[in-house]
């Protein structure tokens, strides 16, 4: 089965690479996950995304869990997911009406 992910291998400043031009087809039977790396810097939030094998992504996210402190300067969070384009934009919260 082939999965599609958003991919920007180099960090993008304040651009979460979630527009159509960043969509790629991952390698069949090898890259079965989408990965997202979010780094918080003084200049803003940096995003890096790619396809990944489940082993590689899980090794990375587990090994670097201690570096993830959302909202804190120099925090780096790595997440893995396995549905199409799941490393895209976070769904916007609906305002209560």
């Amino acid at each position: 089965l082939q999965i599609q992910c958003y991919q920007c291998e180099e960090f993008q400043l304040n651009n979460d690479c979630s527009s159509p031009e960043f969509i790629v087809n991952c390698t069949v039977n090898v890259q079965d996950m989408c990965q997202k790396e979010v780094m918080e810097q003084s200049a803003g939030i940096m995003y890096r995304k790619s396809c990944a094998s489940s082993a590689a992504c899980l090794i990375a996210s587990a090994g670097y869990q201690s570096f993830c402190s959302p909202g804190k300067l120099n925090s780096v969070c790595i997440s893995c997911c396995n549905t199409p384009l799941c490393n895209g934009p976070r769904p916007k919260k609906r305002g209560s009406s």
Epitope: V30, A43, S50, A56, A60
Partner: antibody, heavy 120, light 107 residues
Amino acid sequence: EVQLVESGGGLVQPGGSLRLSCAASGFTITNYGIHWVRQAPGKGLEWVGRIYPDSGATYYADSVKGRFTISADTSKNTAYLQMNSLRAEDTAVYYCARKLWVTLASMDYWGQGTLVTVSS
Amino acid sequence: DIQMTQSPSSLSASVGDRVTITCRASQDVSTAVAWYQQKPGKAPKLLIYSASFLYSGVPSRFSGSGSGTDFTLTISSLQPEDFATYYCQKSYNTPPTFGQGTKVEIK
């Protein structure tokens, strides 16, 4: 035990070609980036390029772009550096190293290096 | 490309001395900096990753600090086996540039 072993170095004439191998054991290369780094005699470390073996995605230093090609054979757990149009300034010890493909990760295991000499 | 500039390029010190090597990035690299030790004829060895984390098996006399653009490697009490060349390297984006190296020699 994690190990990287380079081979294929030697003496080659300017304009010639050489293929270096980096055989990995103790880990699966598909879970890591494999980097090539070189060191000219008496000089510092210079990054050459890298491959993410699971996708085949490669990046190269400007100094070797268009002349060097990095590839990997995941069934052999081995990465390669194909060097074409070699120049005298490519003379160096070539190392392969592994790096988890996340920002904060570093090159934690290195091979012993293989010497490439480009001379007529 | 982001440049990494090390200083000094060489230094002379005695066993027991405290040694400090600095590395400056030309742009913010957060904490994505590593330090390596290399002895003549040998491959580099990882000492510090992510600016301040001691790699497994590395003696605690080595420490790293810094974030953004300024980074420091400190050897609290220099030992005979520490005479070597030290390199900083940024792991943030491609290319993962190395500093030019600092040679630590015996005084």
